[in-house]
């Protein structure tokens, strides 16, 4: 058992059939020495008398609000959760794999720079009961500080019969340099909180291995004479890394209908601009990605060739 | 805007073409590393992550823009001293900084190379021939060092005397990729911004 | 399986016109660019133009501009490539190549042997 | 236009041995470069497209790697039936054009 925060203890188990459980010992938080009695929840049931109070904890059923009373008066509460281990796994029941990049991934990450800011998120399908909290640091044995705003809901979407609610977080190295080179990990802690099931996830990146640029910004069409040719122009977005001549982009412009099947015009360049063939119909669009460290691709910006 | 450098007209800064190879080169050693090594750790998550340069030499800080010099959490060490006949700008007038930045990535590849020769000694000597350096990663690596035209003393190849453990050879090889293919981020990105300036 | 069929040989004379075809077979001929490119004996390959079957839009090789017409009937899906005023340094085997990506070519005719001599 | 230089133009190897090919552009093309491979009397077959992308169906013994200026076709172990030409082609800009070729032959 151990303190997840004031008054609240999460139980460890190992869950599988007529497992022994945790006996655990809760103590009143008071001077009082007499006269004291225990109930859970909003039961009236006592379970026990005296300043402590022992419990074997096996199931869900024994878990939730201890508090401890005198003459009808309330002196203090212990919030037990549970954290199940079923076949030396933590159970990870909460939130819903996302696959990418990998199996097991949880939690996802991204940076529009090198700032030392980047955002987190994750999915579930419980809409109730629900809470979230986040820690993060640089490196684990000496950690350094990063800081994390508070969990929000952030999207929900119908996912055939379910629906799915996305929650994100944007956390902060206190002292980054966007040019340093890094040794340590982000590491990014989520306790997790339902009902009063308790599990956690966590992620560990560096900064530079999550880099996805913001589209470019303010694409221009400038149609060439005598010919299919169009010139496509485009700045670098404005929450990207200065200098833009150190941290330099390289872009994919593409021209292509609104089927991925149909036929396309596709070129690579490191210049803000180039000359593609456009098509009644189709869309010029325009991604990028660091040009020396090759992360993800920004989502596409988009003009109608007309 | 950037640093206070002159330089020749634009695309004729000789080291940018040599930070683009040497980048390429690694990353495809690397590549190779990690496919030929698969059974061993050899990716980012797997392996540690060491700078053999650590207290020897401070490129980053060397060759910070001189944008990202306000910005506190950038310079917190900035104490190395360098010689400083560089040639890479063609131009009498390279600013002190510019000439520390140089000669620092020039110390950095000397003490790469170093490393690699020693590796690729031992690795000569698996019975298993499992992989070896490319040679081209040392070539680029000499034709940029030359491009930079910096005095320094030579540093002798390691020998060692016992038996080598190539499973260790092996892992402090992925380490040494990973680690140069940053390093070699940093320097295509100095280049890069050198040229422009 | 995508097949390009190109038409048989041709022996012209200088200043005369010679038409080649290339018929396509598997997959819908207007969702593909085709191309045509030249290699002359013991040399590498000359780019000559491409067509948008969909929409008869072309794109020639400046070298070629004013000699070369390159036409494409979806109907048949054959796509057709005209040069005019031959000359003998025309001597080459043409293809026609196809993708659904402009700018290279994934699928090729097996390509037709033009002989300019007088 | 765009100069696209092969070298060597003609490269002797021992098969199962690796073979480098080099293509050079006389102006920077990024990624826009692609490789294709050709026996006589045959059309070309595209090995490579965007510098270093596979295509199914070609050998994983085939890869390509190189941006800018400067690229290179590798093949890990030559195999007897990849004795041919190959060439690379730039799509940086029109008009397409073509390396003068590189001839693999056994050594």
């Known amino acids: 058992i151990w303190e997840l925060k004031k008054d609240v203890y999460v139980v460890e188990l190992d869950w599988y059939p007529d497992a022994p459980g945790e006996m655990v010992v809760l103590t009143c938080d008071t001077p009082e020495e007499d006269g004291i009695t225990w109930t859970l929840d909003q039961s009236s049931e006592v379970l026990g008398s005296g300043k402590t109070l022992t419990i074997q904890v096996k199931e869900f059923g024994d878990a939730g609000q201890y508090t401890c009373h005198k003459g009808g008066e309330v002196l203090s509460h212990s919030l037990l959760l549970l954290h199940k281990k079923e076949d030396g796994i933590w159970s990870t029941d909460i939130l819903k794999d996302q696959k990418e990049p990998k199996n097991k991934t949880f939690l996802r990450c991204e940076a529009k720079n090198y700032s030392g800011r980047f955002t987190c998120w994750w999915l579930t399908t419980i809409s109730t009961d629900l809470t979230f909290s986040v820690k993060s640091s640089r490196g684990s044995s000496d950690p350094q500080g990063v800081t994390c705003g508070a969990a929000t809901l952030s999207a929900e979407r119908v996912r055939g019969d379910n629906k799915e609610y996305e929650y994100s977080v944007e956390c902060q190295e206190d002292s980054a340099c966007p040019a340093a080179e890094e040794s340590l990990p982000i590491e990014v802690m989520v306790d997790a909180v339902h009902k009063l099931k308790y599990e956690n996830y966590t992620s560990s990146f560096f900064i530079r291995d999550i880099i996805k640029p913001d589209p470019p910004k303010n694409l221009q069409l400038k149609p060439l004479k005598n010919s299919r040719q169009v010139e496509v122009s485009w700045e670098y977005p404005d929450t990207w890394s200065t200098p833009h001549s150190y941290f330099s982009l390289t872009f994919c412009v593409q021209v292509q209908g609104k089927s991925k099947r149909e036929k396309k015009d596709r070129v690579f360049t490191d210049k803000t601009s180039a000359t593609v063939i456009c098509r009644k119909n189709a869309s010029i669009s325009v991604r990028a990605q660091d040009r020396y460290y090759s992360s993800s691709w920004s989502e596409w910006a988009s003009v109608p060739c007309s | 805007r950037n640093l206070p450098v002159a330089t020749p007209d634009p695309g004729m800064f000789p080291c940018l073409h040599h930070s683009q190879n040497l980048l390429r080169a690694v990353s495809n050693m690397l590549q190779k590393a990690r496919q030929t090594l698969e059974f061993y750790p050899c990716t980012s998550e797997e392996i540690d992550h060491e700078d053999i340069t650590k207290d020897k030499t401070s490129t980053v800080e060397a060759c910070l823009p001189l944008e990202l010099t306000k910005n506190e959490s950038c310079l917190n060490s900035r104490e190395t001293s360098f010689i400083t006949n560089g040639s890479c700008l063609a131009s009498r007038k390279t600013s002190f900084m510019m000439a520390l930045c140089l000669s620092s990535i020039y110390e950095d590849l000397k003490m790469y190379q170093v490393e690699f020769k020693t590796m690729n000694a031992k690795l000569l000597m698996d019975p298993k021939r499992q992989i070896f350096l490319d040679q081209n990663m040392l070539a680029v690596i000499d034709e940029l060092m030359q491009a930079l035209n910096f005095n320094s003393e030579t540093v002798p190849q390691k020998s060692s005397l016992e038996e080598p453990d190539f499973y260790k050879t092996k892992i402090k090889l992925c380490i040494l990729l990973h680690a140069f293919r940053i390093r070699a981020v940093t320097i295509d990105r100095v280049m890069s911004y050198l040229n422009a300036s | 399986q995508v097949q390009l069929v190109q038409s048989g040989a041709e022996v012209k004379k200088p200043g005369s016109s010679v038409k080649v075809s290339c018929k396509a077979s598997?997959?819908?001929?207007?969702?593909?660019?085709l191309h045509w490119v030249r290699q002359a004996p013991g040399q590498g390959q000359e780019w000559m133009g491409w067509?948008?079957?969909?929409?008869?839009?072309?794109e020639y090789a400046p070298k070629f501009q004013g000699r070369v017409t390159i036409t494409a009937d979806e109907s048949t899906s054959t796509a057709y490539m005209e040069l005019s005023s031959l000359r003998s340094e025309d001597t080459a085997v043409y293809y026609c190549?196809?993708?659904?990506?402009?700018?290279?070519?994934?699928?090729w005719g097996q390509g037709t042997l033009v002989t300019v001599s007088s | 236009d765009i100069v696209m230089t092969q070298s060597p133009l003609s490269l002797p190897v021992t098969p199962g041995e690796p073979a480098s090919i080099s293509c050079r552009a006389s102006?920077?093309?990024?990624?826009?470069l692609h490789w294709y491979q050709q026996k006589p009397g045959q059309a070309p077959r595209l090995l490579i497209y965007?510098?270093?992308q596979s295509i199914s169906g070609v050998p994983s013994r085939f890869s390509g790697s190189g941006s800018g200026t400067d690229f290179t076709l590798t093949i890990s172990s030559l195999q007897p039936e990849d004795f041919a030409t190959y060439y690379c082609?730039?799509?940086?800009?029109?008009?397409?054009?073509f390396g003068q070729g590189t001839k693999v032959e056994i050594k």
């Open positions: 190549a196809r993708n659904k990506e402009l700018r290279y070519f994934d699928v």
């Open positions: 082609q730039q799509s940086n800009s029109f008009p397409l054009t």
């Open positions: 102006q920077s093309i990024s990624i826009n």
């Open positions: 965007f510098a270093s």
């Open positions: 067509i948008d079957p969909e929409n008869g839009d072309t």
């Open positions: 598997g997959g819908t001929f207007s969702d593909y660019y």
